[in-house]
Amino acid sequence: MRRERGRQGDSSSCERQVDRVNLKPCEQHIMQRIMGEQEQYDSYDIRSTRSSDQQQRCCDELNEMENTQRCMCEALQQIMENQCDRLQDRQMVQQFKRELMNLPQQCNFRAPQRCDLDVSGGRC
């Protein structure tokens, strides 16, 4: 497990890093997990890449960021924000959030403590 203790990364530094990395593979990976082969999610070609490949790409992107809980939280919040409007109902929002919470562990990172994923001003 990657782990850092103490100061958790300057906020502006994290914002810059999250802006720089490509979070699309993470978004696709989670959507594949909750949607499977459902046809209605046609914004991505879900069948073009296996979920395990997307997960690895996602982890590789997250690995480009500074190893802090703060930056990981910011990345998860950004993923939630990016996908919020695509989530069609409350159940889907909860499913997406559950998968998002599992993402750090899947990538062998420490989950960010105190990370509030309800960041979309009530939209999600």
């Epitope: 103490g6 100061r7 906020s11 703060r70 919040q77 919470m101 403590q113 105190r114």
Partner: antibody, heavy 123, light 110 residues
């Protein structure tokens, strides 16, 4: 019933030391973060320090880091705050609190508080 | 001076509604959960709201919490004279690795 009882406060000269204790009962102490919070006379609340369930992680207010040490004894359901190099600005009521912080996607919150113990730093 | 900004005082008549704001930044309220506390004169504080919107058992639904961006709000409806107290918000600050409290708001029920 959850109970937190602080002790160890008193009058101490600047530069002196005190050790606060908090005896907890009514819940499984070893499964909760614990926190010290203080309140100077007539002022607001100020967080002092957190300690994780197993004592492996501690966080401190900048102005007390290096002078104060938070610790716990899960076998005795007790929380401690060792305060060294005390200053006049450390004068306050010190509260022992149970912190509800649990998993990664929850926050710090203080759902049970002791009655507080007064620490006065004065010459 | 507190990093979390609250109005020093608010007032309203019995039965009315009041809101207390708590303003922070992206490194604290913007990314972390907010809790609210009531401190009656001469007593220890009591938890009213945790994780932005949740109420502990025993806290009436007259008390509510919300959060948007880097600000949080405590709402109290059906004001009672017994609600006269100091109210504090709190959250974690990821940059400071510390819990922050607001400066407190004194509620007066007219």
């Amino acid at each position: 019933e959850v109970q937190l009882v602080e002790s160890g406060g008193g009058l101490v000269q600047p530069g002196g030391s005190l050790r606060l204790s908090c005896a907890a009962s009514g819940f499984k102490f070893s499964t909760f973060y614990m926190t010290w919070i203080r309140q100077a006379p007539g002022k607001g609340l100020e967080w002092v320090a957190n300690i994780k369930q197993d004592g492996s992680e501690k966080d401190y207010l900048d102005s007390v880091r290096g002078r104060f040490t938070i610790s716990r004894d899960n076998a005795k359901s007790s929380l401690y705050l060792q305060m060294n190099s005390l200053r006049a600005e450390d004068t306050a009521v010190y509260y022992c609190t149970r912190n509800g912080l649990q998993d990664s996607y929850s926050g710090d919150f203080f759902d049970h508080w002791g009655q507080g113990t007064l620490v006065t730093v004065s010459s | 001076q507190s990093v979390l900004t609250q109005p020093p005082s608010v007032s309203a008549a019995p039965g009315q509604k009041v809101t207390i704001s708590c303003s922070g930044t992206g490194s604290n309220i913007g990314h972390n959960y907010v809790s609210w506390y009531q401190q009656l004169p001469g007593t220890a504080p009591k938890l009213l709201i945790f994780d932005n919107t949740k109420r502990p058992s025993g806290i009436p639904d007259r008390f509510s919490g919300s959060k948007s961006g880097s600000s949080a709000t405590l709402g109290i409806t059906g004001l009672q004279t017994g609600d006269e107290a100091d109210y504090f918000c709190a959250t974690w600050d990821a940059d400071l690795s510390a819990v922050l409290f607001g400066g407190g708001t004194k509620l007066t029920v007219l």
